[in-house]
């Protein structure tokens, strides 16, 4: 999902050295930055979240806020500190003139400042309910009394918690942080105010139409009667949850965020902190028929982001818009005509649509999974959600062409049994942001903190790329892809796996410059090959070279073009075994695939040879896909021959551990 190069507007205000000395300049070499929502109508100028550096204490936050007020007052400006953050992020929320931004950015401890902006409920039409008969289907979904060990926090509108469908299941907290409703003639009708939240609470844990019928919920009001909230209100809500968790630690927590606003660095940062405190966050991808990476919290990598599909597993269309898509979406779930509790009466039901409803489904599934296995980490839960999803059922033609390869073709489903998946080696594919077209542009894909990067590949629609490599960054391996001159940009594709007690390293062989090609193998005792990458400095690898096929009996070896450096990902983990599987096609073909068989998991996907007519390689579920340029442009010579190379692994250790438990 979205990393630090998100598509938001960043204004770095230049610091004037001749400032009148009222503000202490930040430490040498650092400049605080200003961010605001890229979507102008959603901006809320006049209210700002001042985010302080990570290690700032509450007392320092309060002192910095007071200093800002004092300095503003000296200049004749009134300011109001609305909230001092601590527990999740250090900082404060301030109401002030935009004229003071330059001053505020120079305060000590300031990391960045973000202008407040709006967030919105993601159901359509969330307040134009079509009441359906309360009894709506005979063959009711009746899972076990699932989710009973889990608490689900809902950040939404107010809710009618005594509705028969959810009575006793939802505790309405006293948290409320909502903006005034728009319009002078707005009539605050209770049932409309409660509509969105009541429906979602019903989808998560309703007795009749709920996914996790045993889950208990807590609601926080961050959306007003028009389904509108603010980034700052949502932040304060997330902080409230963190403080509640610290005061009274309970079992697993799921936080449902059925809302979306423009890309927000601060909202994503707060989600990251909460996720790293062991909380599972599930959010709506957004209903804008757009790239989910342009929205928050959908773009936060630590959040499980959910798009919406209908009963036919097609992406949901909502008026002229529809579900968001792209690499920031983790999976899809039902989100069209979803029946749930209606706040129009205490026994009414209604159908609503949107990515909010889809996210509520996944929050319910997550609650069921966590209730069955309370020790699951966020990474383990996400991998299981992906693993148990229905694969390749969505018609990708609905998505823009450039987004199809990036969008996961996964529809959430409950596991056939909530126990017993422990033996599986789970892997997922993580796409980077697009590098951009400049000659030296690179793209980086990262795995979650408790996942292992087992392989790295790259993809470019133009075919102009210089391959990819795994490199260490902040003590973790990342996957970096390199653009080439004249290229329109590249993607890095990481294969991220759950491999307990793994010790992985990268072995590199420089370009061989010999006719045999470049080779590298895993030479350490007990290390197995999980992935191969190749990277080259030349603009164009010669296409006249024949494919270099792997010598038999050397499974722990990566081979590649003689002008490329080759990188082998070598891992040692208890019981880990891997094998190489190849599928070569002598005639040119736009796509070559090779899949791992049942019981094996795809960890590595690469192409032979790495010549320029190969657009790249990437993993889709358990299949390695190698894409080449349009056949019509390559001709049908041997140049067009491509081999897809899959590395398939399994863990005997995980299998044994699982058998011992059963």
């Amino acid at each position: 999902q979205e990393d630090e190069d998100g598509d938001y507007e960043e204004l770095v205000l230049a610091l004037r050295s001749e400032e009148d000395g009222l503000a202490e300049a930040p430490e040498h070499g650092t400049t605080a930055t200003f961010h605001r929502c890229a979507k102008d109508p959603w901006r809320l100028p006049g209210t700002y979240v001042v985010v302080l550096k990570e290690e700032t204490h509450l007392s320092q936050s309060e002192r910095t806020a007071r200093r800002l007020q004092a300095q503003a007052a000296r200049r004749g400006y009134l300011t109001k500190i609305l909230h001092v953050f601590h527990g999740l992020l250090p900082g404060f929320l301030v109401k002030m003139s935009g004229d003071l931004l330059e001053l505020a950015l120079k305060l000590p401890h300031v990391d960045y400042i973000e202008e407040d902006s709006s967030v919105f409920a993601q159901s359509i039409p969330w307040n134009l309910e079509r009441i359906t008969p309360p009894r709506y289907r005979a063959d009711e979904y009746q899972p076990p009394d699932g989710g009973s060990l889990v608490e689900v926090y809902l950040l939404d509108t107010s809710i009618q918690s005594d509705h028969r469908e959810i009575e006793g299941r939802v505790m309405v907290t006293d948290f409320e942080n909502v903006p005034e409703e728009d319009g002078t003639r707005f009539h605050r009708q209770a049932s409309k105010c409660d509509s969105h939240g009541t429906h979602l609470a019903g989808v998560v844990s309703g007795r009749d139409a709920g996914v996790a019928k045993g889950a208990s919920m807590r609601s926080l009001r961050v959306l007003n009667c028009q389904g509108k909230g603010t980034v700052s209100g949502t932040l304060i809500g997330l902080e409230f949850i963190r403080k509640s968790q610290l005061v009274q630690p309970v079992g697993p927590l799921v936080v449902l965020l059925p809302l979306a606003g423009g890309y927000s660095r601060v909202l994503n940062a707060a989600c990251q902190r909460l996720a790293r405190a062991g909380v599972v966050l599930v959010t709506a991808a957004g209903n804008f028929r757009d790239d989910a990476c342009l929205y928050s919290p959908a773009s936060a990598p630590e959040v499980i982001t959910v798009g919406a599909t209908n009963a036919q597993d097609q992406p949901v269309t909502l008026g002229t818009l529809g579900t968001n898509f792209g690499r920031c979406v983790d999976l899809f779930a039902p989100g069209e005509d979803i029946i749930g509790a209606s706040s129009d009466c205490s026994t009414c039901f209604v159908s609503q649509s949107g990515t909010s409803q889809a996210a509520a489904h996944v929050a319910g599934i997550a609650a069921m999974m966590l209730s069955a296995e309370p020790e699951l980490t966020l990474a383990e839960l996400r991998q299981r959600l992906i693993h148990f999803s229905a694969k390749d059922v969505i018609n990708e033609a609905w998505f823009p062409e450039d987004q199809r390869v990036l969008t996961p073709n996964l529809v959430a489903a409950l596991p056939p049994s909530t126990h017993g998946a422990g033996w599986q080696l789970f892997c997922r594919t993580v796409w980077s942001a697009h590098s951009g077209p400049t000659r030296m542009a690179t793209a980086v894909a990262r795995c979650a903190p408790d996942e292992e990067l087992l392989s790295c590949s790259s993809f470019s629609r133009s075919g102009k790329r210089r391959g990819e490599r795994m490199e260490a960054q902040g003590g973790k391996l990342v996957c970096r892809a390199h653009n080439a001159f004249g290229g329109e940009g590249v993607y890095a594709i990481a294969r991220c796996c759950l491999l307990p007690q793994a010790n992985c390293s990268v072995h590199t062989a420089p370009p061989a410059e010999a006719s045999m090609g470049t080779r590298v193998h895993c030479h350490q005792q007990g290390h197995v090959l999980t992935g191969c990458s190749s990277h080259w400095e030349v603009e164009d690898l010669g296409t006249h070279k024949p494919p270099v096929l792997r010598p038999r009996g050397q499974p722990n070896q990566c081979v590649g073009h003689r002008e490329a450096s080759i990188h082998a990902s070598c891992c040692h983990a208890p019981g880990l075994e891997c094998k190489v599987k190849e599928h070569g096609i002598p005639a040119p073909q736009e796509q070559v695939t090779v899949a791992c068989e049942e019981g094996w998991t795809l960890t590595g996907c690469s192409a032979l040879p790495g010549t320029s007519h190969v657009l790249g390689a990437y993993a889709v579920d358990n299949t390695c896909v190698v894409r080449s340029r349009d056949v019509s442009t390559t001709g049908s010579t041997s140049e067009g021959a491509v081999t897809a190379v899959a590395i398939c692994c399994r863990s005997r250790h995980l299998a044994q551990a699982s058998q011992e438990l059963q």
Epitope: V170, M171, V172, R207, T347
Partner: antibody, heavy 115, light 107 residues
Framework: QVQLVQSGAEVKKPGASVKVSCKAS????????ISWVRQAPGQGLEWMGW????????NYAQKLQGRGTMTTDPSTSTAYMELRSLRSDDTAVYYC????????WGQGTTVTVSS | DIQMTQSPSSLSASVGDRVTITCRAS??????LNWYQQKPGKAPKLLIY???SRQSGVPSRFSGSGSGTDFTLTISSLQPEDFATYYC?????????FGQGTKVEIK
């Protein structure tokens, strides 16, 4: 602890009105409404209706035919059931219970309608 | 309205006996069924909710089963304090309705 405490017994003349109260404590009021159920001597249980502590919303049994009104006062955590134009067949024990699922019951209030 | 029919309307049993009471709904109510115990002069007490889930504090000798239209309350080994009247209640639809009751008496 979670409990519903009802007002004391009432003796009323036909045509009069009665108002029974039910004070809730020990749980989150807004998470449940209050159901009212009556039981005539030697008879079974009959649901009269439901009222919300959250927003005052009501749901009445048809049989009440506009004779009954259910209200709540969240400030005192109390629910009320008023029955007008009393008849002798309204003689019963009136119970309040928590929610539609009726997980907790009040001790009951005996209402006798007699001339 | 959904009709709830309980059977038998009364039964005589001895301490230690296994007792079964049935409740039939006039239409499908999924699992929206509760069972109550009422002793003379007392308010009903919830025993089983959602057709089969035991309310906290209720002895394990009480169990409920069924889904759709047919439901059963079973007392595996009748105890002296179990002699009372038992009611089923559906809350699948409003008005919520009760069975006419089953009186369990000492043989």
């Amino acid at each position: 602890q979670v409990q519903l405490v009802q007002s004391g017994a009432e003796v009323k003349k036909p045509g009069a009105s009665v108002k029974v109260s039910c004070k809730a404590s020990g749980y989150s009021l807004t998470s449940y409404g209050i159901s009212w159920v009556r039981q005539a001597p030697g008879q079974g249980l009959e649901w009269m209706g439901w009222v919300s502590f959250y927003n005052g919303q009501t749901n009445y049994a048809q049989k009440l035919q506009g004779r009954g009104t259910m209200t709540t006062d969240p400030s005192t955590s109390t629910a009320y059931m008023e029955l007008r134009s009393l008849r002798s067949d309204d003689t019963a024990v009136y119970y309040c219970a928590r929610g539609y699922g009726m997980s907790i019951w009040g001790q009951g209030t005996t209402v006798t309608v007699s001339s | 309205d959904i009709q709830m029919t309980q059977s038998p309307s009364s039964l005589s049993a001895s301490v230690g006996d296994r007792v079964t009471i049935t409740c039939r709904a006039s239409q499908n109510i999924n699992s929206w069924l509760n069972w109550y115990q009422q002793k003379p002069g007392k308010a009903p007490k919830l025993l089983i909710y959602g057709a089969s889930s035991r309310q906290s504090g209720v002895p394990s000798r009480f169990s409920g089963s069924g889904s759709g239209t047919d439901f059963t309350l079973t007392i595996s080994s009748l105890q002296p304090e179990d002699f009372a009247t038992y009611y089923c209640q559906q809350w699948f639809d409003v008005p919520t309705t009760f069975g006419q009751g089953t009186k369990v008496e000492i043989k």
